[in-house]
């Protein structure tokens, strides 16, 4: 199973089930669904003394992951005290930790309903200079609530003093307002109102709805590729309009910038498709610095037959950044594949999803048509991954047996690139005496014999060999041992393999 971080849940009793004269009380913390072991659970009991007991981990039957419970027993003035259970899982990462802060017991309560309302457009369907979002938190049992606004998952610095609470009978309602600039709203970010109440989280999210397009015609606006942006340093964006009916009227694609600054000269291409429709593309060079600094570009599509203009905008992706991890592999030789081999490259855990993948051989970039790379897909976590596949020929690896898989991504440091090298026959190319490679599994052979005969993967030591502790003069991977025959009066036989 692969590494999996735990989900952490507080374990509390109902307040009404705890006797009022109880001098001590036990609460717990459940960490579940993690792999591998161990987790470390610690408690912050504030000013109170407490004793803890962490139960041995149990295996979850279906997944093979683990679950464990830590119990804390406290005495004294526990009723008003909050307790924090801190769960660390170093196999996930050295600093992976999840804190849960909660009180000894849970009261019966009515949870809030969270709903975001947004201000209207003007009569012409255009957005005003500022947009108001109103978070309504309604119908909850009176108690402390915390409201946080998030933009694409990141906490926003918002003045919450304007939040107002009213009580209707036994239930309360609160509302909080967020004012956004038109630029922020149009940038396609997601806004979330997150409410914490009684140790639970409730939320609602909203973003600018996609325009309802005139039927049948679609427009798309691409971001520059990381390769164009960081390596060629000549980024372009492309506005693509598809499914246009050919007609006498001209399609106009007009570029603009949210800052109002002028745009570069664009190039335009029209293509008639097999199904009779027209595809129009307009490519606009953009300034590397302008793009990196977050400029928003708009493409406006007009046509006499369109009921109204189509608008598309693009800007640098916001949100957290993470550099890609890159791993490269070569497939083994199979019958019928002696003269070609497949190389693969796994690129994972990067954010945002914009990435360019290249293969290089002999310090020359191979044409994109040579390799096949998947579209970015989400990992189980918050990042993305792609696979890239390259077929190489014997002529290529005999010329130089080193192929480079390179990922270009904005979060990669220092030069926006991460690369790996892979060889078809690692360690054998060149045959340098200065750099050695432990051989594949080798049959027991005479020390006097020249050349080590290769055997199939399932070879075993000669029956009279025993496993030694590795040969100091063979600097191969440490898991390879050498078997030495102890026959008297003849040169020893050896077998190198996994003992």
């Amino acid at each position: 199973a692969s590494t999996q971080s735990p989900s952490v849940f507080p374990l509390t009793r109902c307040c009404k089930n705890i006797p009022s004269n109880a001098t001590s009380v036990t609460l717990g913390c459940l960490a579940t669904g993690y792999f591998p072991e161990p987790v470390m659970v610690t408690w912050d009991t504030g000013s109170l003394n407490g004793t803890t007991m962490t139960l041995p981990a149990t295996t979850l039957t279906l997944s093979g992951h683990y679950a464990t419970i830590s119990l804390l027993t406290v005495s004294g003035a526990w009723a008003k005290q909050m307790f924090t259970c801190r769960v660390a899982h170093t196999p996930s990462s050295t600093d992976w930790v999840d804190n849960k802060t909660f009180s000894v017991c849970s009261r019966d309560f009515t949870p809030p309903t969270v709903k975001i309302l947004q201000s209207s457009c003007d009569g012409g369907g255009h957005f005003p200079p500022t947009i108001q979002l109103l978070c309504l938190v309604s119908g909850y049992t009176p108690g402390t609530i915390n409201i946080t606004w998030l933009e694409d998952g990141q906490v926003m610095d918002v003045d919450l003093s304007t939040a107002s609470t009213t009580q209707e009978g036994e239930l309360a309602s609160t509302q909080s307002e967020l004012t956004l600039s038109q630029k922020h709203w149009l940038s396609d970010r997601t806004y979330t109102c997150q409410v914490t109440y009684q140790g639970h989280t409730f939320e609602d999210s909203t973003k600018k709805c996609a325009d309802s397009n005139p039927r049948g015609v679609s427009a798309y606006l691409s971001r520059p590729s990381p390769f164009d942006l960081f390596i060629r340093k000549s980024p372009t964006i492309t506005c693509l309009v598809v499914d246009l009916a050919p007609s006498k009227g001209t399609v106009n694609l007009t570029w603009s910038r949210a800052s109002g600054k002028p745009v570069n000269h664009s190039t335009r291409k029209e293509e008639k498709q097999r199904n009779g429709t027209l595809t129009v593309t307009s490519t606009l060079p953009v300034g590397t610095r302008d793009w990196i600094e977050g400029e928003t570009y708009q493409c406006r599509v007009t046509h006499p037959h369109l009921p109204r203009a189509l608008m598309r905008s693009t800007t640098k992706t916001s949100g957290p950044r993470a550099a890609p991890e890159v791993y490269a592999f070569a497939t083994p030789e199979w019958p019928g594949s002696r003269d070609k081999r497949t190389l693969a490259c796994l690129i994972q855990n990067f954010m945002p999803e914009d990435i360019s993948v290249q293969w290089l051989h002999n310090e020359v970039q191979l044409p994109d048509a040579r390799h096949s790379t998947t579209q970015p897909r989400k990992t189980k976590g918050s990042g993305f991954f792609v696979f890239s596949r390259l077929e190489v020929t014997r002529a290529e690896w005999e010329q130089k047996d080193e192929f480079i898989c390179r990922a270009v991504h904005e979060a990669a440091s220092p030069s926006q690139t991460v690369q790996r090298a892979v060889s078809v026959n690692p360690g054998l190319a060149g045959g340098s005496a200065q750099s050695q490679r432990a051989p594949d599994r080798v049959l027991c052979h005479s020390g006097q014999q020249q050349g080590l005969p290769r055997a199939a993967g399932g070879s075993v030591p000669h029956p009279r060999c025993h496993c030694g502790a590795g040969r100091a003069d063979w600097p191969g991977p440490p898991e390879l041992d050498v078997c030495v025959e102890e026959a008297e009066g003849e040169a020893p036989w050896t077998w190198t393999g996994l003992c």
Epitope: E402, V418, Q419, A421
Partner: nanobody, 117 residues
């Protein structure tokens, strides 16, 4: 041809320091993770530490806080700075190169002897 050449080994007193170098040629150095291994007489070879191609380092518990790895991609060289040396650090030290990122060290140097008296 790929070559990994260690240097800087020698005899040093306990508590002293040494700096090992490993010069690589014939490979695209910036694409490789580099590792240092050591093998004492009669013992299994053990990993001392590794440095990823992005500069992130990992060390065995036995050397943590005493040994430091670094790399100079412009010079195609990886270094192992060894401080507070102990007699049990006596071994042949090998450098190794892994291009895949998977921990498969494809290329190995010949080793350099470090003796701590």
């Amino acid at each position: 041809d790929v070559q990994l050449q260690e240097s800087g080994g020698g005899l040093v007193q306990a508590g002293g320091s040494l700096r090992l170098s490993c010069a690589a040629s014939g490979l695209t150095f910036g694409s490789y993770d580099m590792g240092w291994y050591r093998q004492a007489p009669g013992k299994q070879r053990e990993l001392v530490g590794r440095i990823r191609n992005d500069g992130i380092t990992y060390y065995a518990d036995s050397v943590k806080g005493r040994f430091t790895m670094s790399r100079d991609n412009a010079k195609n060289t990886v270094y192992l700075q060894m401080n507070s040396l102990k007699p049990e650090d006596t071994a042949v030290y090998y450098c190794a190169a892994d291009g895949t990122g998977l921990g498969h060290y494809d290329y190995w140097g010949q080793g350099t002897q470090v003796t701590v008296s």
